[in-house]
Interface confidence: medium
């Protein structure tokens, strides 16, 4: 399976909400011993690799934001922890999973990574990730709403296969 990032760049005004999205593509094993660990974290765009560094998003780690479920099941993070930080990660039946960030500030600008780990018999068998950039702007040059820029199909950084 693969992870695709429909948009590689999100440009948003301060105070707006944004939903960053990744999509799980390809056949997904629905066996009873197979589960999926999905999560989000911040990173830095390294010279060679993207998403190797795992930083918290608004003080929530990838462990805090993770979803763990079988196949294309729907899931979302615990509301109390997420809402305190203005965050929620969610996953639907169609392979889409997302993180919503509310009331954006300039400090939210940066590189965001989604990660999916396929786990069989408690071993992480396959791992795929996607990267996207969030730019939060303020002042007269800031857009009135979030503007999204589609990923190039040639951008190998944004689609990784297991």
């Amino acid at each position: 399976f693969k992870v695709a990032t429909p948009y590689s760049l999100y440009v948003c005004p301060e105070g707006q909400n944004v939903t960053l999205t990744c999509r799980l593509l390809g056949p997904v094993d629905k066996g009873h011993d197979v589960t999926f660990y999905k999560t989000w974290y911040r990173s830095s765009r390294g010279e060679v690799q993207t998403c190797s560094e795992r930083r918290p998003i608004r003080n929530l780690t990838f462990q805090d934001l993770h979803l763990h479920h079988g196949g294309h099941q729907a899931a979302n993070t615990s509301h109390d922890l997420a809402q305190r930080h203005g965050l929620e990660s969610a996953s639907d039946h169609h392979g889409n999973f997302s993180i919503t960030m509310r009331n954006l500030t300039l400090l939210d600008s940066g590189l965001y990574c989604c990660l999916v780990v396929e786990i069989r018999h408690h071993h992480s068998e396959h791992r795929v990730h996607g990267a996207m950039e969030l730019q939060v702007q303020t002042g007269k040059d800031a857009p009135s709403n979030c503007v999204v820029y589609p990923s190039s199909s040639q951008d190998s950084e944004n689609i990784t296969a297991a």
Epitope: Y37, C51, P56, T61, Q63, V117, I119, H123, S124
Partner: antibody
Framework: EVQLVESGGGLVQPGGSLRLSCAAS????????MSWVRQAPGTGLEWVSG????????FYADSVKGRFTISRDNSKNTLYLQMNSLRAEDTAVYYC?????????????WGQGTLVTVSS | DIQMTQSPSSLSASVGDRVTITCRAS??????LAWYQQKPGKAPKLLIY???SLQSGVPSRFSGSGSGTDFTLTISSLQPEDFATYYC?????????FGQGTKVEIK
């Protein structure tokens, strides 16, 4: 039974190079991130470098960045650490360690260690 | 990088004693803290991860607690095989960092 066995340590002069290996067995190697952690004589533990289980994404401590390179050969169940431009302060026992679960950074299995001595 | 500070750096205790070691992080790490035991000439052994989760095969006399910046490892009744050096480690973010260690010696 999970086993990690390091090799390749030894005496090397300052500025020299050394390549450490860590042979893994008893589990599905590709399923786990791996790290090198070192311990200088009589001191504490210092994480050196880590590598992703599938993508070879690597990350390094500032003290070794640009001098050390971590890699893995999943077909051989082996982790490597190429150490160049070695300094006296790199003298330590080097352990390879497995990250415990999915994307975590705690280390549930360690090798026995291999001693690297940098001295003229 | 997140700095980890352990106290005490060493302690003397007797078999059967209750022993407590503390670890402080330079910034909040939620509950992402691990504890290791190391004996001379041996590799570290994972005792506890996620602040309070006991690693498989580790005796129940070991327990961990804490959240945020302050954490504790407790050995409820010290056994002869527990004399060793103990390290805390944050597994909150890259790079993972260790405390300087606490040596538990025989009184």
């Amino acid at each position: 039974e999970v086993q990690l066995v390091e090799s390749g340590g030894g005496l090397v002069q300052p500025g020299g190079s050394l390549r450490l290996s860590c042979a893994a067995s008893g589990y599905i190697f590709t399923g786990y991130d791996m790290s090198w952690v070192r311990q200088a004589p009589g001191t504490g533990l210092e994480w050196v470098s880590g590598i992703d289980g599938h993508f070879d994404s690597s990350f390094y401590a500032d003290s070794v960045k640009g001098r050390f390179t971590i890699s893995r050969d999943n077909s051989k169940n082996t982790l490597y650490l190429q150490m160049n431009s070695l300094r006296a302060e790199d003298t330590a026992v080097y352990y390879c360690a497995r990250s415990s679960y999915a994307v975590d950074l705690a280390f549930d299995y360690w090798g026995q260690g291999t001693l690297v001595t940098v001295s003229s | 990088d997140i700095q980890m500070t352990q106290s005490p750096s060493s302690l003397s205790a007797s078999v059967g004693d209750r022993v407590t070691i503390t670890c402080r992080a330079s910034q909040g790490i939620s509950s992402y803290l691990a504890w290791y035991q190391q004996k001379p000439g041996k590799a570290p052994k994972l005792l506890i991860y996620a602040a309070s989760s006991l690693q498989s095969g580790v005796p129940s006399r070991f327990s961990g607690s804490g959240s945020g910046t302050d954490f504790t490892l407790t050995i409820s009744s010290l056994q002869p095989e527990d004399f060793a050096t103990y390290y805390c480690q944050q597994h909150y973010t890259t790079p993972p960092t260790f405390g300087q260690g606490t040596k538990v010696e025989i009184k």
